[in-house]
Amino acid sequence: IWELKKDVYVVELDWYPDAPGEMVVLTCDTPEEDGITWTLDQSSEVLGSGKTLTIQVKEFGDAGQYTCHKGGEVLSHSLLLLHKKEDGIWSTDILKDQKEPKNKTFLRCEAKNYSGRFTCWWLTTISTDLTFSVKSSRGSSDPQGVTCGAATLSAERVRGDNKEYEYSVECQEDSACPAAEESLPIEVMVDAVHKLKYENYTSSFFIRDIIKPDPPKNLQLKPLKNSRQVEVSWEYPDTWSTPHSYFSLTFCVQVQGKSKREKKDRVFTDKTSATVICRKNASISVRAQDRYYSSSWSEWASVPCS
Amino acid sequence: RNLPVATPDPGMFPCLHHSQNLLRAVSNMLQKARQTLEFYPCTSEEIDHEDITKDKTSTVEACLPLELTKNESCLNSRETSFITNGSCLASRKTSFMMALCLSSIYEDLKMYQVEFKTMNAKLLMDPKRQIFLDQNMLAVIDELMQALNFNSETVPQKSSLEEPDFYKTKIKLCILLHAFRIRAVTIDRVMSYLNAS
């Protein structure tokens, strides 16, 4: 058993049918010695008396808020949560496996640049009695500071019969140098509590591996005289690291017909303009990627050909 | 990347082309190592990230773009002295900082070159003959060093008398390639920045 926060304790259980569970001793936080009784949650049934209460915690029915009283007055509370270990592996019931980029990906994180700021998000089908708390650091043995905000509900989607909820959090490395070569990964730890179930999820990454630039901005077309060709131009996104000559991007320009089946023409360039043939009813899209370290491509920025 | 990007103009800053070749070569070599050594811990998540140039050179600091010198987190100053003459310096007006930066890059390349050559000698003794260093990568390191053209003491190739542990050597190769790829990215950024300046 360990303390998650004041008066909230996590009991770790080897989770299998008929498991013996864990013996837990609760102590009433009071100078009183006599006349103390214990109850669980809203029940008035007296579980025991005395300054300490010994319980065998096996299932969720044994978890909850234990309260010690004296003469009708509440002295203190202890909330017991359960953390299930199933065949040596901690349970992952609360969050959905996003399966991207690989199986068992519960937390996904992205950064728009090298400033040390990043966003993480996760999915769940649970709508109520759910709380998250996020901590982060650079490295784990001698951790350097990363400050995270509060996790907030950022999107709701309907998936088949289920509603899916997306939560996200923004974090900022306290002293980040955009040009630094990372040797210690960022660690992100999310504590999730649903009713009386506790789970924790972690992700470890280098900022360089989670970079996803914003789409190029100011995408414009300029028709070339006496030609079906157009000059496409764009600019670096405002959120990208500067100077751009150091943090350079490479671009992919795509001409896409109205039908998804039509052949796509693609050109790769390091410049912020390109000449392409603009077909009727087609659209031109441009996306960006770090020129020197192949992390994710940005989303497409698009303009119609007409 | 699927399609090649156009090569730089001949009139460009001389080292840019070489540094782009270097990044391509080390990335290819790392990909080959990850595939060939699939049963070894060779992915970025599995290896220890070690920098053999740590406390010996200070490329990131010496090559910091002017715009980032205002960022206190970037000014992790380490005093290192370098030889300051090089042929990549486009004009006589080149600042002392730029010379320091390029000589630091030269020292990095020299250190990695020695490590890679020593390692290749060991890998050639492996009866499994599983993986060797790409000669193209070694040649590209050499070309960039020549383009930088710094006079520097030659570092003798390390020789080892004991029987090599091939498992450890292959893991060290992965560590070295990951670190060298990261340094090659920095070198490319620096050359691109200097070229634009």
Epitope: D14, P17, A19, E59, E86, I89, N103 | -
Partner: antibody, heavy 115, light 112 residues
Framework: QVQLVQSGGGVVQPGRSLRLSCAAS????????MHWVRQAPGKGLEWVAF????????YYADSVKGRFTISRDNSKNTLYLQMKSLRAEDTAVYYC????????WGQGTMVTVSS | SYVLTQPPSVSGTPGQRVTISCSGG????????VKWYQQLPGTAPKLLIY???QRPSGVPDRFSGSKSGTSASLAITGVQAEDEADYYC????????????FGTGTKVTVLG
């Protein structure tokens, strides 16, 4: 006393369907994940499928994906395996088992796919 | 397709020490716990070892398990006639958990 009692096995023609049941008692069935494991005659153990305690997630072996469906009725304390488009290679003894460091197995039920 | 490899058979005379190996990889045994089962003819498998080296109550102490790197092994010290059975190791793969990965199985024969 944890008990898993299986039923539903038998002889079936290729292409036909069969549903296996596993009735649980002696524990809070709705709190635990459950597996199906099979063993072809004279062969080793092969995992077939898993279902979470609340039925929210199901996982299948590639060899049965799209043909077999694992399900549970927590109000009846019963686990099911619906098998469709049966093939000769599905012939095996099928076991249900609890998920956890200590597990309990059903007695097994024989499924024979033969024309 | 079995990813955990066991020898098809091992044998020993009563009282001898018999060991069965179970060889896997970094993503399964290398990063997960191992169980061992005993299966007597016509019966369901019985758990012998869980968590690499833990014995459930009721399992004789002549059975012991260990794990090192990407391999595990089961030892029977002082093998007895009633130990003649099939033995299976089981683990998980970190990418496909909770799918169970079973070993190929080993037939233990007690001679004499």
């Amino acid at each position: 006393q944890v008990q898993l009692v299986q039923s539903g096995g038998g002889v079936v023609q290729p292409g036909r369907s069969l549903r296996l049941s596993c009735a649980a008692s002696g524990f809070t069935f709705s709190s635990y994940g459950m597996h199906w494991v099979r063993q072809a005659p004279g062969k080793g153990l092969e995992w077939v499928a898993f279902i979470r305690y609340d039925g929210s997630n199901k996982y299948y072996a590639d060899s049965v994906k799209g043909r077999f469906t694992i399900s549970r009725d927590n109000s009846k304390n019963t686990l099911y395996l619906q098998m469709k488009s049966l093939r000769a290679e599905d012939t095996a003894v099928y076991y249900c088992k609890t998920h956890g460091s200590h597990d309990n197995w059903g007695q097994g039920t024989m499924v024979t796919v033969s024309s | 397709s079995y990813v955990l490899t066991q020898p098809p058979s091992v044998s020993g005379t009563p009282g001898q020490r018999v060991t069965i190996s179970c060889s896997g990889g970094r993503s399964n045994i290398g990063s997960n716990r191992v169980k061992w089962y005993q299966q007597l003819p016509g019966t369901a498998p019985k758990l012998l070892i869980y968590g690499n080296d833990q014995r459930p109550s009721g399992v004789p102490d002549r059975f012991s398990g260990s794990k090192s790197g990407t391999s595990a092994s089961l030892a029977i010290t002082g093998v007895q006639a009633e130990d003649e059975a099939d033995y299976y190791c089981q683990s998980y793969d970190r990418g496909t958990h909770p799918a169970l990965l079973f070993g190929t199985g080993t037939k233990v024969t007690v001679l004499g």
